[in-house]
Interface confidence: low
Amino acid sequence: RGVFRRDAHKSEVAHRFKDLGEENFKALVLIAFAQYLQQCPFEDHVKLVNEVTEFAKTCVADESAENCDKSLHTLFGDKLCTVATLRETYGEMADCCAKQEPERNECFLQHKDDNPNLPRLVRPEVDVMCTAFHDNEETFLKKYLYEIARRHPYFYAPELLFFAKRYKAAFTECCQAADKAACLLPKLDELRDEGKASSAKQRLKCASLQKFGERAFKAWAVARLSQRFPKAEFAEVSKLVTDLTKVHTECCHGDLLECADDRADLAKYICENQDSISSKLKECCEKPLLEKSHCIAEVENDEMPADLPSLAADFVESKDVCKNYAEAKDVFLGMFLYEYARRHPDYSVVLLLRLAKTYETTLEKCCAAADPHECYAKVFDEFKPLVEEPQNLIKQNCELFEQLGEYKFQNALLVRYTKKVPQVSTPTLVEVSRNLGKVGSKCCKHPEAKRMPCAEDYLSVVLNQLCVLHEKTPVSDRVTKCCTESLVNRRPCFSALEVDETYVPKEFNAETFTFHADICTLSEKERQIKKQTALVELVKHKPKATKEQLKAVMDDFAAFVEKCCKADDKETCFAEEGKKLVAASQAALGL
């Protein structure tokens, strides 16, 4: 039942154009180009996309026409390499154009920048946006795709089409509402937050495939799909995993047309076979394509079948364990992971993968021993501490979150992580710690049975952000070690890091702690970021500062900002009171 075995097509570009339709074809080519050439102006990309689209239409009309038999990588790569300013804008990325496929595409992929030097997206006034939307809806929506894709070069392309559809719906509805802003702004905020989360989740999938290989991604998919579809047979889950792996490999590899096409096929297959997959799919399968695929990806876990037998019989007590393992190691381990995961929707995927790794290690050792059964008989005893560690950590941190609230919980994490890895840049520490802190409001509200999958799998996504940002400019051996040694042990590795005793404190620079009246006009979120940036810098100057010392300084700082923002002459207040604050802080911290 291989969904993706297709007849060979004379023209790949014509085949994808016909499968996807013109609108999706153009949108996906725009996303692909913007994710590769992140600095190019919008107009240049639109021109390239139009040229590719016109060419695709000639191939639809006649698949034997000149160049229609070329691969998509060749066609798109040739098009990207026509950009006149490639060397000036992208430097050594221009050298990719001297290579042949498939090396050229690999070269473009390696130059994708997770933190491109682009201005922050500033949201215009609602009336300005509505006018732009009405004046030229098509350009307005293309601009959205372009701006998101260039800032998130691994965004899951078919999902970005779904976001664009919701973006369009928001403007269509709200630009004719009585109170446009009240209607539109909450919708845009929701799309922004969901978009960031979607981007980060996909970035982890791509990192998993690119840094740890297909086997690692498939193991993740077996565990997650087994939790989600516990009634499905192992063969069914394996088939879904194979197809899902192909979809994500394509999207992470820049093959966005194939990825979107194959994702649609997978959604179709799931809906046609929902009886043997899950009872929760009915509503999803009644939706249009983009909504359907999104809905399936987010669908709740099905109920566990009643009376599942004990795992011990097949995986510990059976005399055939080593025989079964030797015959087909990955299949046997896949069955173990499937059986364990479908019984444990209360575990995080990374925990399930740790258990499977422990089981694999034990079998590797024991199946070579004199008495294998005696050796692996107590392997399940090994699991208890692995399970308890995240349970305890989540319990402690949720208690701390409930005690402090989100902002102060983020601050506690900022201090904790700055002390662990003080070499990491301040903006990265602030961004990552703020996101780590969001685990509280996201997961601590859940009952015990849902806390661990929510929290630990979310933390894996956030720590991957740290890993990809750090990989661009590596500054800490400890971060590199935690990021590269084991995908599933990243979180325990970071949790285990103590204060970095080798760190030489940063020289004190009063400029870092000089603030101006512009802070008063910032939003609450931006003001928090300013204060948290100062907190990180304080810890970098004085890594041995106690919680009490840091709290005292931060309280003084908050009072100083509040006082000066109420003053008549704000700038003078910031200048004079700021000097006093810096002196008092230096004294308090013994700087």
Epitope: K365, D381, E382, P385, E389, N392, P492, A496
Partner: nanobody, 126 residues
Framework: EVQLLESGGGLVQPGGSLRLSCAAS????????VAWFRQAPGKEREFVAG????????YYADSVKGRFTISRDNSKNTLYLQMNSLRPEDTAVYYC???????????????????WGQGTLVTVSS
């Protein structure tokens, strides 16, 4: 290769205390999962307490929880077992075991520990 050498055993009255030490050489003790096991005459070797490699998460057998404390001093490359409120049933030879490769969690399965000390005898009797 890891060498382990236990010390601190002896005769003690019920309710008394002892502190066992295990000096490691050949590898840093914080890079290994380390544990204490014990074997009473005519009985199987059993897990007493363990501590993960690279992370100070500790585990105890139910029979010793609240009475025994495992710890390590990385600067001295030494593992300790503080035993309070000793009972006659704690009488056994106590072994220190190490499992390198920095496992984050210690194992309670003796077979998974490749390195063992010679053992030190603890006798609890009046």
């Amino acid at each position: 290769e890891v060498q382990l050498l236990e010390s601190g055993g002896g005769l003690v009255q019920p309710g008394g205390s002892l502190r066992l030490s295990c000096a490691a050489s050949g590898r840093y003790i914080d890079e290994t999962a380390v544990a204490w096991f014990r074997q009473a005459p005519g009985k199987e070797r059993e897990f007493v307490a363990g501590i993960g490699g690279g992370v100070d998460i500790t585990y105890y057998a139910d029979s010793v929880k609240g009475r025994f404390t495992i710890s390590r001093d990385n600067s001295k490359n030494t593992l300790y077992l503080q035993m309070n409120s000793l009972r006659p049933e704690d009488t056994a030879v106590y072994y220190c075991a190490a499992r390198p490769g920095k496992p984050l969690i210690t194992s309670k399965v003796a077979d998974l520990y490749p390195y063992w000390g010679q053992g030190t005898l603890v006798t609890v009797s009046s």
